[in-house]
């Protein structure tokens, strides 16, 4: 993809239910710009529904997250710095989910417990762009009757099946000044041959994952594209009768402040119901993570707990994390108290997010830590290494790519 | 050290069930996922599906829904594949292998368990 | 059938480059991304590269892959005796919404 470029504004919303978005695995993430600030789609796919515990199979549903891309051994690494020496304990930080697929639907990466899966409650990162390839279809994502993936739903509108995400993390791709939404970890970005998704969560650590459930994306897909089309009033005098029969006062909005503060970089742009369609998911495969601490991000399941390995993922040197202030996002473990920092994510072409399948966040399972809160994230430090702060989205990061990765049992 | 073990050898006859071990070390088996593949004498691999370690979600191909039921036993790093009805088709070498957590693939796979369906 | 079409075969002289082709469709390599593993005979196979291009660790960096559209060719250089091997991509497919292989293609030397 011509480096789009994808800001990425972690929106922390416990409150409502959102309309998952189609998240592609690999290399695009959908970024639903949503008209309505209250409308979140997530990226992530809540699984529409949770697998029982006895492993039967629900249809179309996959609970696990999937989160990174294995490295040599590194695929192999355990969530949990297992990994034999040298391997770098499987957190890559890209988890290439096929691209359209989440990694969850793949079964690859993380593996979501199903509390995790069963979270609706869940931060999401997401991160609209284009993908090239719109196919790909997840159990789990939410899709409309036409089998199309819808994109943003209001709140309280989540399509049916699909569970509520709190903490939806939009992260508008290339949009026009509209208001950034978090990305939000679903389907990873299908586009992919690698998409920027780490998987935070692995199977065996329930509420390791920053609770975001696992999606039942399909693996590395590219991602669909998906055109969210609010249909502007047909007349302005059509539109002038409807407010002016509102007895309700109009609220004034001057002085209201967004949560993200997303509005303030918001330009109304007359013409009603233009509706852009940002469902391109971007080829992560191509992105270079410039963050280029999450290739040190392990994930350990259990634990929330976050452990920066000093290895390097070996982003073949074409991912560069981009996400530049990490070191300012703290992650407050434990409840929507989140601070929530808006970043840009430049994703070159050439920069492979290895957040398909490679960045994977490891975080340690309480067992392993004994630390229960989510996730911790650390900061990126100047080294580009992540220094154990908590940063929300790191973690909604890895959690898309998670979800993708879920799908495919990655 | 990653490791998959498989359970022995099976012969069991048309319509009977085979349930096949896969025991695994070297890991955090809840990390990842567990996906089951089989191979059919001097043929290619078909994948079976997956099951989640952590949940016991599982996700099988549309080829094997109905008889195909995985699930695993945490507390001794175990998952199964349980196929039922079998056929003289199903006669095949069933590899379990590991979901990469950090890319797209397989990364660990079992030593493959030798079913054989005999009339 | 497989989803995945792959040559049976393909052979090469030591130090040779081979290519073994993967072609697929749309809603399967064309959206997601590919993984190779190299099963030596009478053994499991094994992950060779990962995510398209990905190698773990421990695979020579003889062997490539790469992806382009709906084809994710695997490139073997300096061919050698030890990589007489058959050859599988697979990847996820969408409309299957399952792993599917390719045939797999046996490299001799």
């Known amino acids: 993809m011509a480096e789009p470029r994808q800001e990425f504004e972690v929106m922390e919303d416990h409150a409502g239910t959102y309309g998952l978005g189609d998240r592609k695995d690999q290399g695009g993430y959908t970024m639903h710009q949503d008209q309505e600030g209250d409308t979140d789609a997530g990226l992530k796919e809540s699984p529409l529904q949770t697998p029982t515990e006895d492993g039967s199979e629900e249809p179309g549903s996959e609970t696990s997250d999937a989160k990174s891309t294995p490295t040599a051994e590194d695929v192999t690494a355990p969530l949990v710095d297992e990994g034999a020496p040298g391997k770098q304990a499987a957190a890559q930080p890209h988890t290439e989910i096929p691209e359209g697929t989440t990694a969850e639907e793949a079964g690859i990466g993380d593996t979501p417990s199903l509390e995790d899966e069963a979270a609706g409650h869940v931060t999401q990162a997401r991160m609209v762009s284009k993908s090239k390839d719109g196919t790909g279809s997840d159990d789990k994502k939410a899709k409309g009757a036409d089998g199309k993936t819808k994109i943003a739903t209001p709140r309280g509108a989540a399509p049916p099946g699909q569970k509520g995400q709190a903490n939806a993390t939009r992260i508008p791709a290339k949009t026009p000044p509209a208001p950034k939404t978090p990305p939000s970890s679903g389907e990873p970005p299908k586009s992919g041959d690698r998409s920027g998704y780490s998987s935070p969560g692995s199977p065996g650590t329930p509420g390791s994952r920053s609770r975001t459930p696992s999606l039942p994306t399909p693996p590395t897909r590219e991602p669909k594209k998906v055109a969210v089309v609010r249909t502007p009033p047909k007349s302005p005098s059509s539109a002038k009768s409807r407010l002016q029969t509102a007895p309700v006062p109009m609220p004034d909005l001057k002085n209201v402040k967004s949560k993200i503060g997303s509005t303030e970089n918001l330009k109304h742009q007359p013409g009603g119901g233009k509706v852009q369609i940002v469902y391109k998911p971007v080829d992560l495969s191509k992105v270079t993570s410039k963050c280029g601490s999450l290739g040190n991000i392990h994930h350990k399941p259990g634990g929330g707990q976050v452990e920066v390995k000093s290895e390097k993922l070996d982003f073949k040197d074409r991912v560069q994390s981009k996400i530049g202030s990490l070191d300012n996002i703290t992650h407050v473990p434990g409840g929507g108290n989140k601070k929530i920092e808006t970043h840009k994510l430049t994703f070159r072409e050439n920069a492979k997010a290895k957040t398909d399948h490679g960045a994977e966040i490891v975080y340690k399972s309480p067992v392993v830590s004994g630390d229960t809160s989510p996730r911790h994230l650390s900061n990126v430090s100047s080294t580009g290494s992540i220094d154990m702060v908590d940063s929300p989205q790191l973690a909604t990061l890895a959690d898309e790519v998670s979800a993708s990765l879920a799908k495919q049992g990655l | 050290q990653v490791n998959l073990r498989e359970s022995g050898a099976e012969v069991k006859k048309p319509g009977a069930s085979v349930k096949v071990s896969c025991k695994v070390s070297g890991y955090t088996f809840t990390g990842y996922y567990m996906h089951w593949v089989r191979q059919a004498p001097g043929q290619g691999l078909e994948w079976m599906g997956w099951?989640?370690?952590?949940?016991?979600?599982?996700k099988y191909a549309q080829k094997f829904q109905g008889r195909v039921t995985m699930t695993r036993d945490t507390s001794i790093t175990t998952a199964y594949m349980e196929l039922s009805s079998l056929r003289s088709d199903d006669t095949a070498v069933y590899y379990c292998a590991r979901g990469a957590r950090d890319g797209y693939g397989f990364d660990y796979w079992g030593q493959g368990t030798l079913v054989t369906v005999l009339a | 059938s497989y989803v995945l079409t792959q040559p049976p075969s393909a052979s090469g002289t030591p130090g040779q480059r081979v290519t073994i082709s993967c072609s697929g469709g749309?809603?399967?390599?064309?959206?997601?991304?590919v993984s190779w593993y190299q099963q030596l005979p009478g053994t499991a196979p094994k992950l060779l590269i990962f995510?398209?291009?990905q190698r773990p660790s421990g695979v020579p960096d003889r062997f490539s892959g790469s992806k382009s559209g709906t084809s994710a060719p695997l490139a073997i250089s300096g061919l050698q005796s030890e990589d007489e091997s058959d050859y599988y991509c697979a990847t996820w497919d969408d409309s299957l919404n399952g792993w599917v292989f390719g045939g797999g293609t046996k490299v001799t030397v």
């Open positions: 995510t398209n291009d």
């Open positions: 749309s809603s399967n390599i064309g959206s997601n991304a």
């Open positions: 099951i989640n370690s952590n949940s016991g979600a599982t």
